[in-house]
C-alpha cells in the first residue's frame, strides 16, 4: 500500500525503476537546511550526513523544554520524504543536513545565509556530483537571501523552496520569491490547494508548481522506525527536491533551466480548483501538480516553454512592468495584460545583454503585467525587428527578413494615450504569413529566431458573440511560443499563455455591445523543433 | 519575481553631523537600508551589510574594521559576527541602530538589511 503522495507524483512505470546515472559515478547530493534530524531513523540511516553546521537563534520563552524528538521532528520528516527507504521520493539519495531552524522551527535570514555559504564552501573544497538544496522555510521578502540563492544557483546548484504557508502571495516571502529557486506550493490528495488552519499554501506568479503537501507520511523522530503525517509547503518542496534528485541521478548534466522546464512540461495540468485563490491571483498561479518526468532520451528534443509573469506595474501613468527569462532561456515572445484594459502594449528590449519583456500602463489604467514566453531552444539565434508606428490609417508590417529565421512572437506598443483613436494590432496569417501587422499608432516588434529544425505557424481562433475570453491551442507536438489578441473595435485586456493555450481576454463591458461582425481573435504562434529539418515557416 | 515586494527600504543618507573626518564627509551614502515588512519578524540590532559585487576579500575585512573603528570613536562597541566571502561580499554585525547612518556611508556598501526570522513551513 503506497502512500497517496508517492502514487500521485511517480507514474506507474517509474514505481519500481531505479534511477542510475549512465556511468554510475555521479552521486546526487541533497542539502537540507532545517531543524536537527534523527540520523539513526531507519528511513534515512546510512544515507544522511549530519554536518556540524548549526546556526540558530535561541528558543523563545524561559520555560522552553528542549525535547530531542520534537527538535528533530520537521527535519527528520522532510529527510524521509526526500530519500526515505520506504516513504521517500528518491530512495537512497545522499542527504546532508544543516541546522538553521531551532527546536521551535525558527531561524534567521543570517543563519540561512551562513548555511548557504557553507554549502558553497563545501562545493569549492570538494567538488562532487549534482547538488540540490532544499529550503523548507520562509521569512519576509529578503533581497539578500534572494541574492544569495541567485549566486548559488549560478554555480550549478539547484535550489528548491517552500512557497510558504501563509495563504498569501509567495512573492512577499523569501526564498520563495527568488526567481532562481524552484518554488513549490502544496496540494492535497484531491489535487486541491492545501488549507492549514485559517491559512494555507501560498500562491501567485512566484510559485513554479504545486506538489503533495497534506497528510504526507514520513519518518517520525519519535522512534527509529516510526512514521507520522505532516502537512505544509515544506513537504511539497521535499517532493520536488526528490524528483529533481531522481532526474539528476539519471541525467547529471541537466541544468536548472532544463529541470524547471521539464518539471512544468510533464506536470499534471488543470486539476487544481483555482477558485480557492484570490481572484486577482488566479491568472498568475500555475495550475500544475508535479510528477516525475521521463528522461530526455525517452522524450526527444521537444521545444519546452513556460510563461513568466512580471510583477504588477502599479497604476502610475508611465508605469512599466518587466518580465525576465532565466539566463539559459530564449525570450520568444512578449505580451501584456491589464484588468482594466488600459495598457499601451508591450515590447522586447535588451537590458544588460539580456532581452526582457516590457509592458506599459496607460493613463487611467490600474496597472499592467508583462508576460514573457521563455523557451529552451538549443543553439538558437534570436533577434528583434521593430518598425515605428505608421501614419494614421496605415498598417505596419514586420517580418523576419534574415534567412532561415522564423517568427516566434509579436509585440505591439502604442505611442498614443487615447485608447479610442486607435484600432488594436492584428496578426495576419493568411495574407501575410510570418508577419506581425500593427494598426495606427502601433510600433510593431517581431521576435525572429533561427535554430536547427525550428518551424513555426500561426493558429487563430475568433469568436463573434459575447465572450470574456477567446482561446486557441497548439496541437500535440507543437509548442505555443507567441500569443496575441486581435480584436474588432472592442477593448481587450490583453493576452497570455497558459501552458499550450493562448488566452485572449476581452473587457467585460465590451461584451454586450459587440456586433457579430467584430470578432475577437486569439492568435497563437505554434512552433516545434525537429533537429533534422531546416528552420521554416509553416502556412 | 525578484522585484522588491512588500518590503521596507529606507534611505538613511544623512550627512554626518559629528564627523569631522575627511573621508567620511566626502562619501555621501547611496546605499539603502532594508528591513522586513512584518514588524514581529524583525531582529533589530543585527544587520547584514552587503557590499558591491566586485568588492575584494581584503576590502570586505577593511570595511568591517572601518565600521568598528568609527563606531568606537562614537563610544559604540560593535561585534562582527560573520564575514561573507563565498556567496556575496558582506558581513554580519551586531550593533546599535544609531550606527546605520554611519554604516551606509562606508565605501563599497550596496545596502544593509536588518536580520529577520524565517520559519519552518
Amino acid at each position: 500500500s503506497i502512500p497517496w503522495n508517492l502514487e500521485r507524483i511517480i507514474p506507474a512505470w517509474h514505481q519500481t525503476e531505479e534511477d542510475r546515472s549512465p556511468d554510475g559515478s555521479s552521486q546526487v547530493e541533497v542539502y537540507l537546511l532545517d531543524t536537527s534530524i534523527q540520523g539513526a531513523h531507519r528511513e534515512i540511516e546510512g544515507r544522511v550526513t549530519i554536518t556540524d553546521f548549526n546556526s540558530v537563534p535561541e528558543e523563545d520563552g524561559t520555560r522552553f523544554h528542549r525535547q530531542a524528538s520534537k527538535c528533530d521532528s520537521h527535519g527528520t520528516h522532510l529527510a524521509g520524504v526526500v530519500s526515505g527507504r520506504d516513504a521517500g521520493v528518491a530512495k537512497g539519495t545522499s542527504l546532508h543536513s544543516l541546522r538553521v531552524l531551532n527546536c521551535q522551527g525558527k531561524g534567521t535570514v543570517s543563519g540561512t545565509l551562513i548555511g548557504l555559504e557553507f554549502i558553497r564552501k563545501s562545493q569549492l573544497i570538494q567538488p562532487s556530483g549534482p547538488l540540490v538544496v532544499l529550503l523548507p522555510l520562509a521569512g519576509g521578502y529578503s533581497r539578500i537571501l534572494n541574492a544569495a540563492c541567485r549566486h548559488l544557483a549560478r554555480t550549478g546548484v539547484v535550489l528548491v523552496a517552500a512557497a510558504g504557508n501563509f495563504r498569501d502571495d509567495a512573492c512577499l516571502y523569501s526564498p520563495a520569491s527568488a526567481p532562481e529557486v524552484i518554488t513549490v506550493g502544496a496540494t492535497n490528495a484531491q489535487d486541491q490547494p492545501v488549507t492549514l488552519g485559517t491559512l494555507g499554501t501560498n500562491f501567485g506568479r512566484c510559485v513554479d508548481l504545486f506538489a503533495p503537501g497534506k497528510d504526507i507520511i514520513g519518518a517520525s523522530s519519535d522512534c527509529s522506525t516510526c512514521f507520522m503525517s505532516q502537512s505544509g509547503t515544506s513537504q511539497a518542496a521535499a517532493h520536488v527536491a526528490g524528483i529533481v534528485a531522481r532526474m539528476l541521478s539519471r541525467e547529471p548534466t541537466l541544468t536548472l533551466a532544463e529541470l524547471r522546464q521539464r518539471l512544468i512540461h510533464f506536470s499534471t495540468k488543470d486539476v487544481i480548483n483555482m477558485a480557492w485563490f484570490p481572484e486577482d491571483q488566479q491568472v498568475l498561479t500555475p495550475n500544475l501538480v508535479a510528477t516525475l518526468p521521463p528522461s530526455t532520451h525517452e522524450t526527444g528534443g521537444q521545444l519546452l516553454c513556460r510563461t513568466v509573469w512580471s510583477a504588477h506595474s502599479g497604476p502610475t501613468r508611465t508605469a512599466t512592468a518587466t518580465a525576465r527569462c532565466a539566463p539559459e532561456e530564449e525570450l520568444l515572445s512578449c505580451s501584456s495584460f491589464s484588468r482594466s484594459g488600459r495598457r499601451r502594449g508591450d515590447w522586447i528590449e535588451a537590458i544588460g545583454g539580456q532581452q526582457v519583456c516590457k509592458a506599459l500602463n496607460a493613463f487611467g489604467g490600474e496597472g499592467v503585467y508583462a508576460v514573457a514566453r521563455c523557451c529552451l531552444v538549443p543553439r538558437a539565434n534570436c533577434s528583434i525587428h521593430n518598425t515605428p508606428a505608421a501614419r494614421a490609417g496605415l498598417e505596419t508590417h514586420v517580418h523576419c527578413h534574415q534567412k532561415d529565421h522564423v517568427l516566434t512572437g509579436c509585440s505591439f506598443h502604442w505611442e498614443v494615450e487615447d485608447l479610442s483613436v486607435r484600432r488594436q494590432p492584428a496578426l495576419r496569417s493568411r495574407r501575410q504569413p510570418g508577419q506581425c501587422v500593427g494598426h495606427q499608432a502601433a510600433s510593431v516588434y517581431a521576435s525572429c529566431c533561427h535554430a536547427p529544425g525550428l518551424e513555426c505557424k500561426i493558429k487563430e481562433h475568433g469568436i463573434s458573440g459575447p465572450s470574456e475570453q477567446v482561446t486557441v491551442a497548439c496541437e500535440a507536438g507543437w509548442t505555443l511560443t507567441g500569443c496575441n489578441v486581435l480584436p474588432g473595435a472592442s477593448l481587450t485586456l490583453g493576452a497570455y499563455s497558459v501552458d499550450n493555450l493562448c488566452v485572449a481576454r476581452v473587457h467585460d463591458t465590451a461584451r454586450a455591445d459587440r456586433t457579430s461582425g467584430e470578432a475577437t481573435v486569439a492568435a497563437a504562434i505554434c512552433c516545434r523543433s525537429r533537429p533534422s529539418a531546416k528552420a521554416s515557416w509553416v502556412q | 519575481q525578484d522585484e522588491d515586494g512588500d518590503y521596507e527600504e529606507l534611505m538613511l543618507a544623512l550627512p554626518s553631523q559629528e564627523d569631522g573626518l575627511a573621508d567620511e564627509a566626502a562619501h555621501v551614502a547611496t546605499a539603502t537600508f532594508r528591513r522586513c515588512s512584518k514588524e514581529a519578524w524583525r531582529l533589530p540590532g543585527t544587520y547584514i551589510v552587503v557590499l558591491m559585487e566586485e568588492t575584494q576579500r581584503l576590502q570586505i575585512e577593511q570595511t568591517a574594521h572601518r565600521l568598528q573603528t568609527r563606531a568606537a570613536r562614537r563610544g559604540y562597541v560593535i561585534k562582527v559576527l560573520h564575514i561573507f566571502y563565498d556567496l556575496f561580499p558582506g558581513f554580519l554585525v551586531k550593533m546599535s541602530s544609531d550606527l546605520l547612518g554611519l554604516a551606509l556611508k562606508l565605501p563599497h556598501v550596496e545596502y544593509i538589511e536588518e536580520d529577520s526570522f524565517v520559519f519552518a513551513q
Epitope: S1, H41, R42, S69, G84, A87, C223, T225, C226 | -
Partner: antibody, heavy 118, light 108 residues
C-alpha cells in the same frame, strides 16, 4: 555464538518481589539494547521495557512503569529485571531478547517462569 | 498507538498445504515489520525481518511480503515442524514494541 540465559524465576507470594537475570554472551554487550517481554499462560507477547547497556538508559511500557526496574552490570554482561508488588496476573514466562532499536528481536533467552500465588 | 490485527486467529491445515497469515497495521509502518514463530514451551524465533527478509537459518518456504499497512507471511508448503503460533511485530513511539495477537497454525 549469541546466547541469552535467564534465571531467577519461581514461585512468589502476592505483593512480593523478585529479580530476574539475563546473562549475555557471544557479542559486544554494549552494542545492543535488551528487551524484557513476558507471556502469560495461553496469551500473547507483551513488552515490559528495555535498557541500553551502553549508557544505561531505560524505557518502560507505561503499564509497568511503577512495577518494573531494569538495570545492568557491564562487568558481568548481565541485565536485571526487578519486579515489585506482584499479583496473580503477573504470572508469566519472562523473556529477555536483544535488538538494535528499530530492528528485529533477533535472539531470545529460553524464558523463565514466574508464578505468583499464595 | 499502533494496533496490529492478525488474521485468521487460527488456521487449520494439513502438511504440504500453503499457509497465508495476514497482519494489518492501524497506521503506516513502511516495511519495518517482523514475523516470529513460537512453538509450545519455546521462546519466539525470528523468521522474517523488515517485511520480506528471511532471518539466518530460516528455510526458503517462509516468505514475507507487503508494506505500508498490509503484510503477509506465507509458508509455501507446511512441514510438520511449522505447526506453531506466529506473531507480527512493529515499533512505535509508545509503547515502542507492539506485537500482533498471534495466529495459531494447527494440524487439520
Amino acid at each position: 555464538q549469541v546466547q541469552l540465559l535467564e534465571s531467577g524465576g519461581g514461585l512468589v507470594q502476592p505483593g512480593g518481589s523478585l529479580r530476574l537475570s539475563c546473562k549475555a554472551s557471544g557479542y559486544t554487550f554494549s552494542s545492543y539494547s535488551i528487551y524484557w517481554v513476558r507471556q502469560a499462560p495461553g496469551k500473547g507477547l507483551e513488552w515490559i521495557g528495555w535498557i541500553d547497556p551502553g549508557n544505561g538508559g531505560t524505557r518502560y511500557n507505561q503499564k509497568f512503569q511503577s512495577k518494573a526496574t531494569i538495570s545492568r552490570d557491564n562487568s558481568k554482561n548481565t541485565l536485571y529485571l526487578q519486579m515489585n508488588s506482584l499479583r496473580a496476573e503477573d504470572t508469566a514466562v519472562y523473556y529477555c531478547a536483544r535488538a538494535r532499536v528499530g530492528y528485529s528481536l533477533d535472539y531470545w533467552g529460553q524464558g523463565t517462569l514466574v508464578t505468583v500465588s499464595s | 498507538e499502533i494496533v496490529l490485527t492478525q488474521s485468521p486467529a487460527t488456521l487449520s491445515l494439513s502438511p504440504g498445504e500453503r499457509a497465508t497469515i495476514t497482519c494489518r497495521a492501524s497506521q503506516y509502518v513502511g516495511s519495518y515489520l517482523n514475523w516470529y514463530q513460537q512453538k509450545p514451551g519455546q521462546a519466539p524465533r525470528l523468521l522474517i525481518y523488515d517485511a520480506s527478509n528471511r532471518a539466518t537459518g530460516i528455510p526458503a518456504r517462509f516468505s514475507g511480503s507487503g508494506s505500508g499497512t498490509d503484510f503477509t507471511l506465507t509458508i509455501s508448503s507446511l512441514e510438520p515442524e511449522d505447526f506453531a503460533v506466529y506473531y507480527c511485530q512493529v515499533w512505535d513511539s509508545s509503547p515502542p514494541v507492539v506485537f500482533g495477537g498471534g495466529t495459531k497454525v494447527e494440524i487439520k
